[in-house]
């Protein structure tokens, strides 16, 4: 049994770490290997991920930590029993993936303009409180080539827009997913999509 | 080994005061954040509080909020819960808990509010 | 806040049987959420966390499954020793939650 892919562990710099990796073969991940996690000083406890499976020869552990520090630093030792398969470390401050945006809401009852508002994913004290940004995707569910991107820069969790930049009285479907240019992120997850019915009142035409 | 030991409850009339304490023991303390949770008799756990390790930022239930106290003295290896104007919904088994996610739990100590 | 609600409150089991418990939450909480057992006058021991992830030491007939919304404990072959009751709960925001419990007693 060898590991075909090293794992790769990633954070979302509060209390989860996931780390994934390939095996050489099908493996019954959570019967046949530990992922044991320690974080580095003195008297620190090592904790012992079961992992599940993540595709035939692919496995994924979810590692519980406490409240990231930037200084936070963990080894990675993983066993088949008592065979060590693989040993390495892992810094979860330079492998953030935020948590993704929640309670994503459209509100239509601004005057012809869609006014978007999320939830920021951390509590106020957590450093990527204060330091997220977003992407917001906007979708016509009639028209797959009506699809659209608008970057958030700024702190506050909302977009505004025009109704009139959308076409009027189809569907339309928004998501956003978050990223830390401090931590140099990846992007979260999508959040989970919204929906709702565009209508405007047409500018009258005059020929 | 990981302990956590209670202290400070009892019986307290509506509106008065009590002070909980939790000793912990068997890993580094200050590396950890820790979590109050209570247990009214016969009822389901209740999360109360929550203080980080890494910012000391606290969190309360709504039902404690403006009330209750949580901190911590690291040199101490000690956890505290300062209870005010307590309730007779107050009374319950109050639990110190450990991070992440209630790893480790101490035995309890018990509230009772009551005239 | 975020309210989290488990179902059934109480259920008769016999040793054996395939238990299924499911907790509900009021909003998206990926998978933020975790399963405690706790047996009379004792104190509560997780049993699952991530949704789907297995404590160290728990017996492998304990699972989790489930994310967003809509999440499952399930005891594939109950034993003498899970009659006990069950919480969910959630960590993905303050105030964290519990659901109400699932007390499972012996038919």
């Known amino acids: 049994m060898k590991v075909l892919q090293e794992p790769t562990c990633v954070s979302d710099y509060m209390s989860i770490s996931t780390c994934e990796w390939d095996m050489n073969g099908p493996t019954n991940c959570s019967t046949e290997l530990r992922l044991l996690y320690q974080l580095v000083f003195l008297l620190s406890e090592a904790h012992t991920c079961i992992p599940e499976n993540n595709g035939g020869a692919g496995c994924v552990c979810h590692l519980l930590m406490d409240d990231v520090v930037s200084a936070d630093n963990y080894t990675l030792d993983l066993w088949a029993g008592q065979q060590l398969l693989w040993k390495g470390s892992f810094k979860p401050s330079e492998h953030v993936k935020p948590r993704a945006p929640g309670n994503l809401t459209v509100h239509t009852n601004v005057s012809d303009t869609l006014l978007l508002t999320w939830s920021n994913p951390y509590p106020p004290d957590n450093y990527l409180y204060n330091h997220l940004t977003y992407a917001v995707n906007i979708w016509s569910e009639n028209d797959p080539a009506d699809f659209r991107i608008y970057n958030v820069t700024y702190l506050e969790p909302s977009l505004r827009i025009a109704a009139s930049t959308l076409k009027s009285g189809i569907s339309y479907r928004a998501r956003v997913r978050a990223w830390a240019q401090c931590y140099n992120t990846t992007w979260s997850e999508w959040s989970p999509s919204t929906k709702w019915h565009n209508s405007y009142r047409e500018p009258f035409e005059q020929h | 080994q990981v302990q956590l030991v209670e202290s400070g409850g009892g019986l307290v009339q509506p509106g008065g005061s009590l002070r909980l304490s939790c000793v912990a023991s068997?890993?580094?303390?200050?590396?950890?954040?820790m979590n109050w949770v209570r247990q009214a008799p016969g009822k389901g756990l209740e999360w109360v509080s929550y203080?980080?390790?890494?910012?000391?930022?606290?969190y309360y239930a709504d039902s404690v909020k403006g009330r209750f106290t949580i901190s911590r003295d690291n040199a101490k290896n000690s956890l505290y819960l300062q209870m005010n104007s307590l309730r007779d919904e107050d009374t319950a088994v109050y639990y110190c808990?450990?991070?992440?996610?209630?790893?480790?739990w101490g035995q309890g100590t018990l509230v009772t509010v009551s005239s | 806040d975020i309210q989290m609600t488990q179902s059934p409150s109480a259920m008769s089991a016999s040793v054996g049987d395939r238990v299924t418990i499911t907790c509900r939450a009021s909003?998206?909480?990926?998978?933020?959420l975790a399963w405690f057992q706790q047996k009379p006058g004792k104190v509560p021991t997780r049993l699952i966390y991530?949704?789907?992830s297995l404590q160290s030491g728990v017996p492998s007939r304990f699972s989790g499954s489930g994310s967003g919304t809509e999440f499952t404990l399930t005891i594939s072959s109950l034993q003498p020793e899970d009659f006990a009751t069950y919480y969910c709960?959630?960590?993905?925001?303050?105030?964290?939650?519990f659901g109400q419990g699932t007390k499972v007693e012996i038919k």
């Open positions: 909003q998206d909480i990926s998978n933020y």
């Open positions: 808990a450990r991070e992440p996610v209630f790893d480790y």
């Open positions: 991530a949704a789907s």
């Open positions: 203080i980080s390790r890494a910012t000391g930022a606290v």
């Open positions: 709960l959630q960590w993905s925001s303050y105030p964290r939650t």
């Open positions: 068997g890993f580094t303390f200050s590396h950890s954040s």
